[in-house]
Interface confidence: medium
């Protein structure tokens, strides 16, 4: 921000009023009126361009200092060239000294050139020369000079003529100040430069109404230059929830609008299923029947628990079951949708019933499934099970209520049994096979059916109670269909895979595991 | 020594034209300021135009804008008064006068000149 | 305009007295004043500039004063020579005035 200039004297503004003192008295230094632009202007002027040594002095008034540290005089006027008086006017000059004197008091009348210091010889940019004269074009030089730090109570500037034609036409003398500034939502007061130039004053900023710093943020700090810039931001302050910046200021939300935290963003509309919040809100309350999960933005609109699964199917496979859903027709506003499948059984003969989490297995585990099916395994034969599958959502748990939808299947088969081939040689094959723990209580025997490949006229059983056999009196190198199925006492089980199994050739004889 | 020698006085009627002239010697004519000022018979001083040293600006009496024209031609050292219009209360001794403001010892020029070097004048009277 | 109004319009003085002649300006023109002295059938010829500047060559017992509004001529021992008619003229503004004259004969 551009420096504040505090004016200590301005003599062009006072309209011949100041009552200067010249040295010496009534030569020298005249204090003339001239008319520019129609106007009347005063000045103060000497032209003693013909009379040899001239040591003409004219000094302010006294200028008190007040906070001043360092002054800056800007001066405006105007030199004739030498070149324009006849004869070149041997002793004329272009050029005057400008002097300081601090002091605590005015000394009047009393004038000692001696307590003044010397600022610097003024030169002009421009002379005036005769044409210029004639046309009354004023060549107008303007000069700063800068003083500090002064420590007295007031100053008199001075001005020493040794034989120029000049003319003073302005005298400001002022000091600078870093002015009133509002910046990132900071107010920083008005700071008296410093009179050092390398130096810059730090200046703590207070934030405006309804402004905060933010959280792990720097407190807001600027630095007064000399010339009276603020430099260096640092930090800034924020508005905080329920306030959003309005040019330099923060300003209360509007109703129907919030913001929840402090941040550089605007107030946001109040989201989708919320009751109008009042002004300066940091959120918006949901509407009955929705909510609002803990981990949600308040920008998020609230939402509600889903529907049930749409639409189950359980479709059964000996001892496994897949169970098929559709999501939920209204998913409450949410995408974060997951499934969970528990399981009952019921035993057809007592028709008691209990949960069957732990005697099943499940493809994936069944809580917080986020597809639509899951594989149910090691299902009991001969028992009734229903499925239920259950939609859940981040607002789930701030309800009572749940969202599921049920299948029931009964399994009326054991599961096929799992078959290797554990040996063979060129006349025999042993065979194992394994069903799951929960079913084999159910098991009977086991009837082991084979036949040569190709052969479709005959084939041999053999029952077995055990979970092998070997079978023998088979034809070397010779390819085998073999079946193992599962006997309960309410009759046949699910029938394995059929397997093809091969003996070993007579030049390979001996008993060979695989 | 500056000389200022004026012409082209006489007798002339109303609505009449007259062209005067102002020959001058002895100083840098370019270099000065040139004005006509007449003094009507028994009465005091009038200023009546100026013109700047190198032909501009020109300024006129309120009596005589628009019937005078000012003119100055620097490589003859001559200034001259075009009178067109004449009435009876233009008649009076038209002087030529000079000002140089190098003899002027003021940092600011006044906003007007004042007359350093006169010529004797011409007479110019205007009657039917 | 700027009128120039000269007082007395003539006086008469004897050969050494100190005469004193004023000008008074219609509104503020600062030192912006000439004094001419003509005599019958001459030309004007310049006395004073900047209303207390002497011209070149004209002698010292010519002296003049004041700013403003008010001004004066002043000879401090009237010589012969001085009988004539004195004008003031302003030239602050562009339409320069002179005063109507002060006619100065001898006692």
């Known amino acids: 921000a551009q420096g504040k200039e505090v004016v200590l004297l301005d003599f062009a503004a006072a309209g011949g009023e100041l009552g200067w003192l010249t040295h010496p008295y009534g030569k020298g230094w005249d204090l003339m009126q001239n008319i520019m632009n129609d106007m009347p202007i005063y000045m103060y002027s000497v032209c003693n361009v013909m009379s040899g040594d001239q040591d003409n002095w004219l000094r302010t008034n006294w200028v008190y200092r007040g906070e001043a540290e360092r002054i800056f005089i800007e001066l405006k006027f105007t030199v004739r060239d030498c070149n324009s008086f006849p004869g070149g006017a041997s002793s004329c000059k272009e050029t005057f000294n400008l002097y300081y004197a601090e002091s605590d008091l005015d000394y009047g009348t009393n004038f000692q050139k001696r307590l003044f210091t010397k600022i610097d010889t003024i030169a002009p940019d421009e002379i005036t020369v005769s044409s210029d004269f004639e046309a009354r074009h004023v060549k107008l030089n303007v000069e700063e000079r800068s003083v500090g730090p002064l420590t007295r109570k007031g100053f008199y500037l001075a001005f020493q003529d040794i034989g120029a034609c000049v003319a003073l036409l302005s005298v400001r003398v002022y000091y600078k100040k870093c002015p009133e500034l509002l910046q990132g939502l900071a107010h920083f007061p008005e700071t008296i430069a410093g009179s050092d130039a390398p130096s810059l004053a730090t200046v703590a900023g207070t934030c405006v109404d309804h402004a905060v710093v933010p959280p792990g943020g720097e407190e807001p700090r600027m630095h007064c230059a000399v010339d009276g810039e603020w430099l260096v931001p640092i930090g800034q302050c924020l508005c905080q929830a329920g306030y959003e910046k309005v040019e330099d200021a923060c300003q209360a939300c509007s109703p129907g609008f919030f913001k929840f935290e402090a941040s550089e963003s605007p107030c946001l509309e109040c989201p989708e299923h919320t009751l109008p919040s009042p002004e300066g809100a940091t959120s918006c309350e949901c509407e009955e029947g929705f909510f609002r999960a803990p981990q949600d933005p308040a920008s998020m609109p609230c939402t509600r628990p889903p529907s049930a699964p749409h639409y189950l199917t359980a479709v059964g496979m000996g001892a496994k079951v897949e169970l098929r859903w559709t999501p939920p027709q209204d998913s409450g506003g949410r995408e974060d949708i997951v499934y969970s499948v528990t399981c009952e059984q019921c035993w057809p003969e007592s028709g008691e019933c209990g949960p069957c989490e732990a005697s099943v297995r499940y493809s994936e585990p069944p809580h917080g499934l986020t597809r639509t099916s899951v594989t149910v395994s090691d299902l009991e034969p001969h028992m009734n099970y229903t499925f239920t599958v259950e939609a859940r959502n981040g607002v789930s748990g701030l309800v009572t209520s749940r969202s599921f939808r049920t299948a029931s299947v009964s399994i009326n088969q054991t599961e096929p049994p799992k078959v290797r081939l554990e040996g063979r040689s060129t006349t025999s094959l042993s065979v194992s096979w394994s069903i799951p723990p929960p079913q084999q209580s159910r098991v009977w025997k086991y009837e082991v059916t084979y036949r040569k490949k190709g052969d479709s006229n005959s084939y041999n059983v053999r029952r077995t109670e055990g979970f092998s056999v070997t079978l023998d009196d088979l034809a070397p190198d010779t390819t085998y269909l073999v079946q193992v199925q599962a006997l309960t006492q309410e009759g046949q089980g699910a029938g394995s895979k059929v397997h093809e199994f091969q003996t070993l050739s007579p030049e390979g004889s001996g008993n060979l595991a695989v | 020594e500056v000389q200022l020698l004026e012409s082209g006085g006489g007798l002339v009627q109303p609505g009449g034209s007259l062209r005067l002239s102002c020959a001058a010697s002895?100083?840098?004519?370019?270099?000065?300021?040139m004005a006509w000022v007449r003094q009507a018979p028994g009465k005091g001083l009038e200023w009546v135009s100026r013109?700047?040293?190198?032909?501009?600006?020109?300024h006129y009496a309120d009596s005589v804008k628009g019937r005078f024209t000012i003119s100055r031609d620097n490589s003859k050292n001559t200034l001259y008064l075009q009178m067109n219009s004449l009435r009876a209360e233009d008649t009076a001794v038209y002087y030529c006068?000079?000002?140089?403001?190098?003899?002027?010892?003021?940092?600011?020029?006044?906003?007007?000149?004042?007359?350093?070097?006169w010529g004797q004048g011409t007479l110019v009277t205007v009657s039917s | 305009d700027i009128q120039m109004t000269q007082s007395p319009s003539s006086l008469s003085a004897s050969v050494g007295d100190r005469v004193t002649i004023t000008c008074r300006a219609s509104q503020s023109i600062s030192t912006w004043l000439a004094w001419y002295q003509q005599k019958p059938g001459k030309a004007p010829k310049l006395l004073i500039y900047k209303a207390s500047n002497l011209h070149t060559g004209v002698p010292s017992r010519f002296s003049g004063s004041g700013s403003g509004t008010e001004f004066s001529l002043t000879i401090s021992g009237l010589q012969p020579d001085d009988f004539a008619t004195y004008y003031c003229?302003?030239?602050?503004?562009?339409?320069?005035?002179f005063g109507q004259g002060t006619k100065v004969e001898i006692k």
């Open positions: 003229q302003q030239y602050q503004s562009y339409s320069r005035t």
């Open positions: 013109i700047g040293p190198s032909g501009g600006p020109t």
């Open positions: 006068a000079g000002y140089d403001s190098g003899y002027d010892y003021v940092a600011v020029a006044g906003p007007a000149e004042y007359f350093q070097h």
């Open positions: 002895g100083f840098t004519f370019s270099h000065y300021m």
